[in-house]
Interface confidence: medium
């Protein structure tokens, strides 16, 4: 004979566990119904009745399979720095990351907490370390017979055109000048310039409206300009 | 239905203090959302005052930090505005209103409580 | 502090489509700004339209819908209707407050 389907709440065989999407209670000392993601517990489980799910309210959400009695508090609401890049709804938490051109000075377990922007090199340095989503730009001095004139977060140094006859020689954050006779060897004219870092940015649809209610908890650091290294701009 | 209703003493002197109520009948200020003040001055103008979460803590508009608080009584379902030192430039028409989280809309408001601040 | 400009007013007829706009003074609206649309009937009563750049209220008609239009928010009235002469307010998120712009007065030419 095939073994009876057991249904929730149900007392489990001894050593044996209880089956998926179910829990054990202790207080009842049963085998009981979990809440799917977007749920909670809103009354626990008894000997002879199942665990009773509620729907999560406004700006709260449970991602997993659950017995909690409360939904988790979503992330506060990104800071004009950043871009929403997961929208709070009831099975999933915010999530923010920096706009181009920042990086995350302080990073969360999803997304970034605190973004600043990107350090730009000011003339006579260019870039050694690009930025990434979570480093800032690391500025070097131009090497002799390299500049850079441009105040930068992507701009490198570049090597200074070669003349026939000097006009006015290159320094760090000057390009040789050269006679009217044109160089002999010349840099591309534009500056080079190192790929910005790109984040990947699903477009996230919020579903519709439905009854619903809770905020946001966590808290926003205050944003300062992040100081300026030798040879940077906190522009 | 979910209802907001201010009250509020309407005529204040001038350095005194601004208290004023918003009783929210058909949900828990527990529950959820954002629990807001905002004013209309005279000539339509709104500005957003702060709020209160649905576990007690606060957002206020930088421009009124220093003069400004919301709490709230979680028993009576109700929240206050407490907006320290004022001026004739806080005449308005003060409003409660309720925003979440997942939608960012502002869907209920309360009518309105006119606050006259003269000596 | 920012600033948050709308057309101060706007002129349609009924049936006509007609976008207000929302215009940021630190630049480009963006999502993370959560743009926020309330209407304002007479008697001070104010009904909140959209959230969060596109989300419609519970109740609003459909009619109603937000967007980002170039650097703007945006909100369309897709066939005009008498009752929709009101003043609409746009209200922008700025990573922890928020502001509302000065307001646009449509009439709707009946």
């Known amino acids: 004979l095939p073994a009876q389907v057991a249904f929730t709440p149900y007392a489990p065989e001894p050593g044996s566990t209880c089956r998926l999407r179910e829990y054990y209670d202790q207080t009842a000392q049963m085998c009981c119904s979990k809440c799917s993601p977007g749920q909670h517990a809103k009354v626990f489980c008894t000997k002879t009745s199942d665990t009773v799910c509620d729907s999560c309210e406004d700006s709260t959400y449970t991602q997993l399979w659950n017995w909690v009695p409360e939904c988790l508090s979503c992330g506060s609401r990104c800071s004009s720095d950043q871009v929403e890049t997961q929208a709070c709804t009831r099975e999933q938490n915010r999530i923010c990351t920096c706009r181009p051109g920042w990086y995350c000075a302080l990073s969360k377990q999803e997304g970034c907490r605190l973004c600043a922007p990107l350090r730009k090199c000011r003339p006579g340095f260019g870039v050694a370390r690009p930025g990434t989503e979570t480093s800032d730009v690391v500025c070097k001095p131009c090497a002799p017979g390299t500049f850079s004139n441009t105040t930068s977060s992507t701009d490198i140094c570049r090597p200074h055109q070669i003349c026939n006859v000097v006009a006015i020689p290159g320094n760090a954050s000057m390009d040789a000048v050269c006679t009217s006779t044109s160089p002999t060897r010349s840099m591309a004219p534009g500056a080079v310039h190192l790929p910005q870092p790109v984040s990947t940015r699903s477009q996230h649809t919020q579903p519709t409206p439905e009854p619903s209610t809770a905020p946001s908890t966590s808290f926003l650091l205050p944003m300062g300009p992040s100081p300026p290294a030798e040879g940077s701009t906190g522009d | 239905d979910v209802q907001l209703q201010e009250s509020g003493p309407g005529l204040v002197k001038p350095s005194q203090s601004l208290s004023l109520t918003c009783s929210v009948t058909?949900?828990?200020?527990?529950?959820?959302?954002?629990w807001n003040w905002i004013r209309q001055f005279p000539g339509n103008k709104l500005e957003w005052m702060g709020y209160?979460?649905?576990?007690?803590?606060?957002n206020y508009n930088p421009s009124l930090k220093n003069r400004i608080s919301i709490t709230r009584d979680t028993s009576e379902n109700q929240f206050f505005l407490k907006l320290n030192s004022v001026t004739t430039e806080d005449t308005a028409t003060y409003y409660c209103?309720?925003?979440?989280?997942?939608?960012?809309?502002?869907?209920?408001w309360g009518q309105g409580t006119t606050l006259t601040v003269s000596s | 502090q920012a600033v948050v400009t709308q057309e101060s007013a706007l002129t349609t007829s009924p049936g006509e489509t007609v976008t207000l706009t929302c215009r940021s003074s630190?630049?480009?609206?963006?999502?993370?700004?959560?743009a926020n649309w309330v209407q304002e009937k007479p008697d001070h009563l104010f009904t909140g339209l959209i959230g969060?750049?596109?989300n419609r209220a519970p109740g609003v008609p459909a009619r109603f819908s937000g967007s980002v239009i170039g650097d703007k928010a945006a909100l369309t009235i897709t066939g005009a209707q008498t009752e929709d002469e009101a003043i609409y307010f746009c209200?922008?998120?700025?990573?922890?407050?928020?502001?509302f712009g000065g307001g646009t007065k449509l009439t709707v030419l009946g």
């Open positions: 209160i979460t649905n576990d007690g803590s606060n």
């Open positions: 058909g949900s828990s200020i527990t529950s959820g959302y954002y």
């Open positions: 209200a922008l998120w700025y990573s922890n407050h928020w502001v």
């Open positions: 969060g750049t596109n």
């Open positions: 209103a309720r925003d979440g989280g997942w939608f960012h809309y502002f869907d209920y």
């Open positions: 630190t630049g480009a609206v963006t999502t993370s700004n959560y």
